[in-house]
Interface confidence: medium
């Protein structure tokens, strides 16, 4: 139902949902710190522009009695309960930050008259695509899917001379929230990825995955999975792998590959890692001292959500426009704003664009090296290492189907 907004007369409030069920198991205190750091920057920027207004955040906590799984499984009702709480207290701000779970975001979007913008650090699933007042500040599944199709089709690079049209997808149901929705998108029969591939099979058991590694009758040489190197090792161990197997390991929110003195373990030699271009911005930040590389991205998304609101507030106030209007609610897209870590670009549907990086393990140096980058904003691949020292024959990626000639 319609809730009055605390969003006028020079006082602008941000409603931050602090849900027990979250895309990443992050202490709420860290997210509070991220929000507060963002508020300090926003206040300064507004003051700096000669706009003497007040900006605050209200943290809305659920009681945690009913919805306490800690992951996203019971988030649907928790999100609606929090919205009810906001409605009863008449405490809605100009913008809603959170939730991060796809289930809760989807349901909240359906069940509310969204005359206010909603900013999410997460909501990775395809069901949250193309929502007119939803902005997502962590790479959603659609962006991953577009990269994979683009990469599969590529056949004009020195290290990739075959188009691919097949894949196995390993999905055993224990994935983290981001991985769950990334793999869910690849599995969905109606998705762009499925539509563009001629063959795709989901492997759900560890043994299925392990058997494929040396199966002479396999239908594809390419296996997509999601997680970190340790996750792969638990599954693969030191098992022998056929020489033309390529494992694509999706591990977007993990900076560890770029840290100094990181050596790639031997079991990563058949693996291409897809991750995001790294950031070092939060290492010295007051709220990030105890964050792992993955959690840094999550906290940063909360901080950037505050900065995005500040950016839009500044524009509307400078133009003398009302904040509590559909125009404001629909404005959080197709723009670039100054995030904490540098410029942040949102596409036409309010989803963050980024530079994805595909890494390989150099057989010479045992280091992770950048093979190519991909700009999600323009859906374009940029080769970086034209002469990679691959484990694969002739330092080229193999065909996706054994024995098939050049495409």
């Amino acid at each position: 139902s319609q809730v009055s907004q605390n969003c006028h007369n020079g006082s602008y409030e941000i409603s931050v949902l602090m849900m027990g069920n979250s895309a990443f198991a992050e202490p709420l205190k860290n997210l509070e710190d991220a929000v507060n750091e963002g508020l300090e920057i926003v206040r300064g920027r507004l003051q700096n522009a000669g706009l003497n207004v007040t900006v605050n955040a209200t943290f809305m906590y659920s009681d945690g009695l009913i919805h306490n799984s800690g992951d996203c499984r019971s988030s649907t009702c928790e999100g609606l309960d929090l919205l009810r709480k906001i409605s009863n207290a008449q405490r809605m701000g100009c913008v809603l930050i959170g939730p991060s779970c796809t289930y809760s975001t989807f349901q909240m979007y359906l069940d509310t008259e969204l005359s206010y913008p909603m900013i999410s650090a997460g909501s990775f699933g395809l069901s949250c695509d193309y929502k007119e007042t939803l902005t997502r500040l962590m790479s959603p599944a659609r962006k991953l899917m577009y990269f994979l199709v683009n990469f599969w089709k590529t056949n004009d690079l020195p290290f990739k001379t075959y188009s691919w049209s097949t894949s196995y997808v390993y999905k055993n149901g224990t994935e983290t929230e981001d991985c769950f929705w990334y793999l869910n998108a690849l599995e969905a029969s109606v998705s762009y990825f499925s539509h563009e591939l001629g063959f795709k099979v989901v492997l759900r058991q560890d043994k299925e995955f392990q058997d494929i590694l040396m199966d002479h009758n396999r239908k594809s040489n390419v296996i997509i999975m999601c997680g970190g190197p340790e996750f792969l090792y638990k599954l693969k161990g030191d098992r022998a792998v056929a020489e033309d197997i390529v494992i694509i390991l999706v591990d977007l929110f993990n900076d560890q590959y770029f840290e100094d003195n990181v050596t790639a373990p031997d079991y990563m030699k058949n693996v291409l890692v897809l991750t995001l271009s790294p950031g070092n911005s939060l290492l010295n930040s007051s709220f990030s001292r105890n964050l792992s590389p993955t959690k840094r991205d999550f906290a940063l998304a909360y901080l950037n959500g505050i900065l995005l609101f500040g950016h839009m507030l500044k524009i509307f106030l400078e133009n003398g426009e009302n904040i509590t209007t559909p125009k404001f609610a629909h404005a959080f897209r197709n723009l670039t704003f100054e995030g904490y870590d540098g410029p942040v670009t949102l596409d036409d549907w309010g989803d963050v664009d980024s530079t994805m990086v595909l890494l390989y393990t150099s057989v010479d140096t045992k280091k992770y090296k950048v093979l190519l980058t991909y700009d999600t904003h323009v859906n374009k691949t940029y080769p970086v290492d034209m002469s990679p020292t691959f484990t694969w024959k002739n330092s080229k990626l193999p065909n996706d189907i054994t024995g098939r000639g050049p495409q």
Epitope: I41, N48, E318
Partner: antibody, heavy 119, light 107 residues
């Protein structure tokens, strides 16, 4: 208390490359843009460009093809290189810090380095 | 690029008098404007940002006003240490740009 200390060659010949470094002491290095601004003798201030801890750069199109700005976060330093200098590049060069993150006005300045280009 | 124009180029004022300096932008900068003071041999010093907000430690005799394209810096009662060159600067867009300066000298 934040302090900016800058250094570099003061006398150059035409066509050489100007090279200046600015070190930041005290305060946070991340969370700010760090700028280079110059002032020819007896004239006004000209903004050259800026960089943040991540290496994101904004620079002045009038100098863009000759300017390189870089950052070394491990040393809390940033640097300016200006190639193919001429007498018109003779100026006092200042490094400066914004008042806050991405604010565009400058509350901390280096001491300035006079760079003279002469054959 | 936004061009900033200051007037007058030189302003002669007696100590204790009021000084009024003008700055005009070639297009709107809303209130994204700063004023600096510079003395010979020194780096500029930030006086005003946001068109009218005094920076930390700046005396109350300095005040800024204006928005859009027309701005004014007023020095209420000139002290001996106020004789210097004053610059305006816009930070609405890149590249940042400064005015050519107004020299406030003793009359």
């Amino acid at each position: 208390q934040v302090q900016l200390q800058q250094w570099g060659a003061g006398l150059l010949k035409p066509s050489e490359t100007l090279s200046l470094t600015c070190a930041v002491f005290g305060g946070s290095f991340s969370g700010y843009y760090w700028s280079w601004i110059r002032q020819p003798p007896g004239k006004g201030l000209e903004w050259i460009g800026e960089i943040n801890h991540r290496g994101n750069i904004n620079d002045n199109p009038s100098l863009k093809s000759r300017v390189t700005i870089s950052v070394d976060t491990s040393k809390n330093q940033f640097a300016l290189k200006l190639s193919s200098v001429t007498a018109a590049d003779t100026a006092v060069y200042y490094c400066a810090r914004e008042r806050g993150y991405s604010f565009g006005n400058y509350d901390h300045w280096g001491q300035g380095t006079l760079v003279t280009v002469s054959s | 690029e936004i061009v900033m124009t200051q007037s007058p180029a030189t302003l002669s004022v007696s100590p204790g008098e009021r000084a009024t300096l003008s700055c005009r932008a070639s297009q709107t900068v809303t209130r994204n404007l700063a004023w600096y003071q510079q003395k010979p041999g020194q780096a500029p010093r930030l006086l005003i940002y946001g068109a009218s907000t005094r920076a930390t430690g700046i005396p109350a005799r300095f005040s800024g006003s204006g928005s859009g394209t027309e701005f004014t810096l007023t020095i209420g009662s000139l002290q001996s240490e106020d004789f210097a060159v004053y610059y305006c600067q816009q930070y609405k867009s890149w590249p940042r740009s400064f005015g050519q300066g107004t020299n406030v000298e003793i009359k």
